[in-house]
């Protein structure tokens, strides 16, 4: 760091009171998954137990936008989250034990880039340190995966089918079902980040209904079966 305070001694070549931070050069993860950004540090203040703030920022050191911030009261091991961008960042490490490791949920391709950890001692040992190097997060594209397919009761004793898939880039969804035409109009719902949902609003015939998800990396399929026995509504999947 910009070196800490030196004791008032005339000793020559005293070690500069410096911090250090250990971060890996790179972390790789797939879109839609979670990633852990490890960060540990050492500091020159022996047994600091005062208030502290843990910060992660993106883009560039010292000046990039903060994506996560938490503060711990004196003596407390609990770091209260004050900022978690889009609610997707969570501290895994314990800053009191020199660990600032961060978990990032629901990764998107846009999360790729450099992340920098920082710790601030805001008590008597007024000091702070930030990693200049940072850790590079590489988020790779993901082939489609169907995470949920279901048949639900609809209006007027009818049934509807829902299909939710994830992938990066977000996949296009299509439903196909019993004849005639073998293909049915699907309502493509709003996606949440890397997830998309398509609804087939009215299942008019018994049989197999297939949801297909496709993007530039591949395709995935899943099916549900609708059977109605003795005129009573029911499903078998």
């Amino acid at each position: 760091d910009a070196s800490g305070d030196l004791l008032n001694t005339e000793a020559h070549s005293a070690p500069a009171q410096r911090w250090s931070m250990q971060v890996p050069a790179e972390v790789n993860a797939e879109a839609g998954d979670a990633a852990v950004l490890p960060c540990t540090f050492t500091h020159p203040h022996r047994h600091y137990d005062g208030p502290l703030t843990a910060i992660w920022r993106s883009g560039e050191p010292y000046a990039g936008p903060q994506v996560f911030r938490c503060t711990a009261a004196p003596g407390s091991e609990l770091c209260q989250t004050a900022l978690s961008l889009h609610g997707r960042f969570r501290l895994l490490g314990n800053p009191r034990r020199n660990d600032l490791s961060l978990r990032v949920e629901r990764l998107a391709l846009a999360d790729s880039g450099r992340y920098f950890c920082r710790v601030e001692f805001t008590g008597d040992a007024h000091d702070r340190y930030e990693s200049r190097h940072g850790v590079r997060l590489r988020v790779t594209a993901a082939a489609p995966r169907i995470v949920n397919i279901s048949v639900l009761p609809g209006p007027a004793h009818a049934f509807r089918a829902l299909c939710t898939a994830e992938g990066e880039p977000p996949p296009a969804l299509a439903w196909s079902g019993p004849a005639p035409g073998n293909s049915s109009a699907a309502l493509q719902g709003q996606g949440h980040g890397y997830q998309v949902t398509a609804e087939l609003p009215a299942l008019t015939r018994d049989g197999r209904y297939t949801c297909t998800a496709a993007n530039s990396l591949g395709r995935a399929e899943a099916s549900v079966y609708l059977f109605r026995f003795h005129g009573a509504p029911g499903t078998s999947t």
């Epitope: 070196s3 305070d5 500069a16 410096r18 911090w19 050492t42 020159p44 340190y129 930030e130 200049r132």
Partner: antibody
Framework: DVQLQESGPGLVKPSQSLSLTCTVT?????????WNWIRQFPGNKLEWMGY???????TYKPTLKSRISITRDTSKNQFFLQLNSVTTEDSATYYC???????????WGQGTTLTVTS | DVLMTQTPLSLPVSLGDHASISCRSS???????????LDWYLQKPGQSPKLLIY???NRFSGVPDRFSGSGSGTDFTLKISRVEAEDLGVYYC?????????FGGGTKLEIK
Amino acid sequence: DVQLQESGPGLVKPSQSLSLTCTVTGYSITSDFAWNWIRQFPGNKLEWMGYIRFSGSTTYKPTLKSRISITRDTSKNQFFLQLNSVTTEDSATYYCAREDYDGLFDYWGQGTTLTVTS
Amino acid sequence: DVLMTQTPLSLPVSLGDHASISCRSSQTILHSNGNTYLDWYLQKPGQSPKLLIYKVSNRFSGVPDRFSGSGSGTDFTLKISRVEAEDLGVYYCFQGSHVPYTFGGGTKLEIK
């Protein structure tokens, strides 16, 4: 962009005190880092003199400790070097520089030349 | 104090040549936290020094990759793979592991 600019008298008489100012723009000296004074003697030898940290604490080169003082004016975003009892040996170009967390001087002023002569 | 000794004092080169500058410290500058705070600076005539390499081998932002640093303990080297006209000037090593921080005496890179 971060910029540092030294200013001073240029000429000082032996046994007097030297006062130099470093004005920082583009960054608050109370935000982070250590703010250093470094001098370069004729013949190009560089000497680190000391710093004042963002927190206000100071560290000096032990051989200068008896006559050096580094202070700051946070309202003007300036920090200062005072060197007492100067001799001709203190004639040099004086630089201010920002030291970041990795012990490196990433921003320097352009330097101000000081001559000690009677 | 930690004495930093640079060799050679002067290094005449032709443009396009490789150049190597050595820096030796009088004691180890491995800090107790595991880092070695050894930097290299270039000073061109009439200018303030500019940072090239920090912590032995890390190129500072904007520094061309023809500059590289290496070493450990007490022996360090700055290499320039293909000297260009803009590389001419005085090179200094610097240690920030121990107080007082100290600079090497400088190596002047000049045209042969």
